[in-house]
């Protein structure tokens, strides 16, 4: 807390300019009018203030706006944004995407800070849903943003926003998140033709059910092994050898290298060995010829 002292004669700041960097902490406190600072916030970012001086400027704004800063000030905070605590930011009402962009720019190229996380949370809650423009902006600054959301939060993403998602934005998503995103993507891309549809839906397929994988196998999509390895195990298990062969096309040969890894390993265990042999890949571990396979889950459902 800076002590209240009178401003020395002739030192009262008439504008926010570089002469202020020579002011001591107490002089900044005494000689800079908070209302002047608020109207000229955009100048602060071009002036080499020390961290200590930035603390004083923040203190002045806090006194002027105890209930939270207005958006006109927030938009021009620049470096000062990084001096804000999440508690400060929770008092704000940020509605403009331009304000959000301006503040994200301050932290560009760095991991999401607690300040940024709180800002985004406030912004998205204020909007009620993650619209396309917001998602576009957030994933541009933080490619992993989407995968940082809980399945519950992802449920508020409208299908139209899915068009903004790039494959790399889904790199760190887990199956629970893809379970939520996949139906939205399916809806968003439903009017596209086969090959174009597959290109768009491919990175969401970790949430696809068996029926959709069976349908894709009829469309000559040539799914790569990297995508196949990310599919849900429970969705892959019911696929026949013929369906997997059609689904992967020329990439089917890659199964051999992955035969010890899920979901390939578990899928092999469910197939008849003679069906696997038709692939000519030397895959081993299938059900020996002459064995009867009882689907106990089906039996339980019937009883």
């Amino acid at each position: 807390e800076v002590e209240k002292t009178a401003c020395p004669s002739g030192k009262k700041a008439r504008e926010i300019d570089e002469s202020l960097i020579f002011y001591k902490k107490w002089e900044l406190e005494a000689c800079v009018d908070a209302a002047l600072l608020a109207t000229q916030m955009d100048r602060v970012n071009a002036i080499p203030f020390t961290y200590e001086q930035l603390d004083v400027l923040k203190h002045k704004l806090d006194e002027l706006y105890p209930q939270g800063y207005p958006e006109s000030v927030i938009q021009h905070l620049g470096y000062l944004f990084l001096k804000m605590s999440p508690e400060d930011i929770r008092k704000w009402n940020v509605t403009s995407l331009e304000t959000l962009k301006a503040l994200l720019e301050v932290n560009k190229g760095h991991e999401m800070s607690p300040q940024v996380a709180t800002l985004i949370d406030r912004f998205v809650k204020g909007r009620g849903q993650l619209d396309k423009d917001t998602l576009d902006t957030l994933t541009a600054f933080y490619p992993g943003y989407l995968c940082s959301l809980s399945p519950e939060e992802l449920s508020s993403v409208p299908p139209s926003s899915i068009w903004a998602v790039r494959p790399q934005d889904l790199d760190t998503c887990d199956p629970r998140q893809l379970d939520v995103l996949y139906p939205k993507a399916r809806l968003a891309f439903q009017n596209m033709n086969g090959s174009e549809y597959f290109v768009k839906i491919q990175s969401f397929l970790g949430g696809a059910p068996t029926e959709d994988l069976k349908a894709l196998s009829q469309q000559n999509v040539s799914m790569d092994l990297a995508t196949f390895m990310k599919l849900r195990t429970d969705a892959v298990l019911p696929l026949t050898v013929a369906e997997v062969q059609k689904l992967l096309g020329p990439h089917v040969e890659g199964l051999k290298a992955e035969e010890r890894h899920r979901p390939v390993r578990d899928w092999i265990l469910r197939q008849r060995q003679d069906d696997l042999d038709t692939l000519g890949l030397g895959l081993q571990g299938g059900i020996p010829n002459g064995y009867l396979v009882l689907d106990l889950s089906m039996q339980e459902a019937l009883s």
């Epitope: 080499p48 020390t50 961290y51 200590e52 001086q53 930035l54 470096y79 605590s85 607690p114």
Partner: antibody
Framework: QVQLVESGGGVVQPGRSLRLSCAAS????????MNWVRQAPGKGLEWVAV????????YYADSVKGRFTISRDNSKNTLYLQMNSLRAEDTAVYYC????????????WGQGTLVTVSS | DIQMTQSPSTLSASVGDRVTITCRAS??????LAWYQQKPGKAPKLLIY???SLESGVPSRFSGSGSGTEFTLTISNLQPDDFATFYC?????????FGQGTKVEIK
């Protein structure tokens, strides 16, 4: 006068950890940001990390993200660099350096401490 | 990250010469550029900040200029003590990237 003294360097095997320290004196440590900069033998300077005066803002070079952690103890006037999963390419002299604001240069530097990562 | 490119990488000169080192930024950094001098086995020393401001105690034969993306360091009357490696560094972002260095050696 401002003084920065690094310590904690030495020889370490790849994959192991090391913690560097930088003892500061001659200025108000809690008012300024502190940086780590390194220099591989015969090479140029590479900025590694910065921590702001209050300790809550930390930024890292891509080459060390997720492996190195910068921290500070303002009550002890000491800066730290925790280095995990060390690689041969982390071999360098590590300098600590001060900056007084987001738009200030590195005005004071320590003498450096050598870290050698080798099996 | 902002890339900094220095040229030349090595410069041979004689005492009394005027030498110029250039530094180019991959994007505009306004005037937030510093120049450092480093001698073998020693820590870098700040010479110039904000592109053209001379650090206290640095001889006036050192000068800097430029803004945006193009910057120069000039030593107007090279002295025996000036043979060293010089680095530029941008500090307009928190990732304070350096140029690769220019070694000024005796011709």
């Amino acid at each position: 006068q401002v003084q920065l003294v690094e310590s904690g360097g030495g020889v370490v095997q790849p994959g192991r950890s090391l913690r560097l320290s930088c003892a500061a004196s001659g200025f108000t440590f809690s008012s300024d940001a502190m940086n780590w900069v390194r220099q591989a033998p015969g090479k140029g300077l590479e900025w590694v990390a910065v921590i702001w005066n209050e300790g809550s803002n930390k930024y890292y070079a891509d080459s060390v993200k997720g492996r190195f952690t910068i921290s500070r103890d303002n009550s002890k006037n000491t800066l730290y660099l925790q280095m995990n999963s060390l690689r041969a390419e982390d071999t360098a002299v590590y300098y600590c350096a001060r900056d007084r604001g987001p738009l200030w240069p590195l005005d004071y530097w320590g003498q450096g401490t050598l870290v050698t990562v080798s099996s | 990250d902002i890339q900094m490119t220095q040229s030349p990488s090595t410069l041979s000169a004689s005492v009394g010469d005027r030498v110029t080192i250039t530094c180019r930024a991959s994007q505009s950094i306004s005037r937030w550029l510093a120049w450092y001098q480093q001698k073998p086995g020693k820590a870098p020393k700040l010479l110039i900040y904000k592109a053209s401001s001379l650090e206290s105690g640095v001889p006036s034969r050192f000068s800097g200029s430029g803004s945006g993306t193009e910057f120069t360091l000039t030593i107007s009357n090279l002295q025996p003590d000036d043979f060293a490696t010089f680095y530029c560094q941008q500090y307009s972002s928190y990732s304070r990237t350096f140029g690769q260095g220019t070694k000024v050696e005796i011709k």
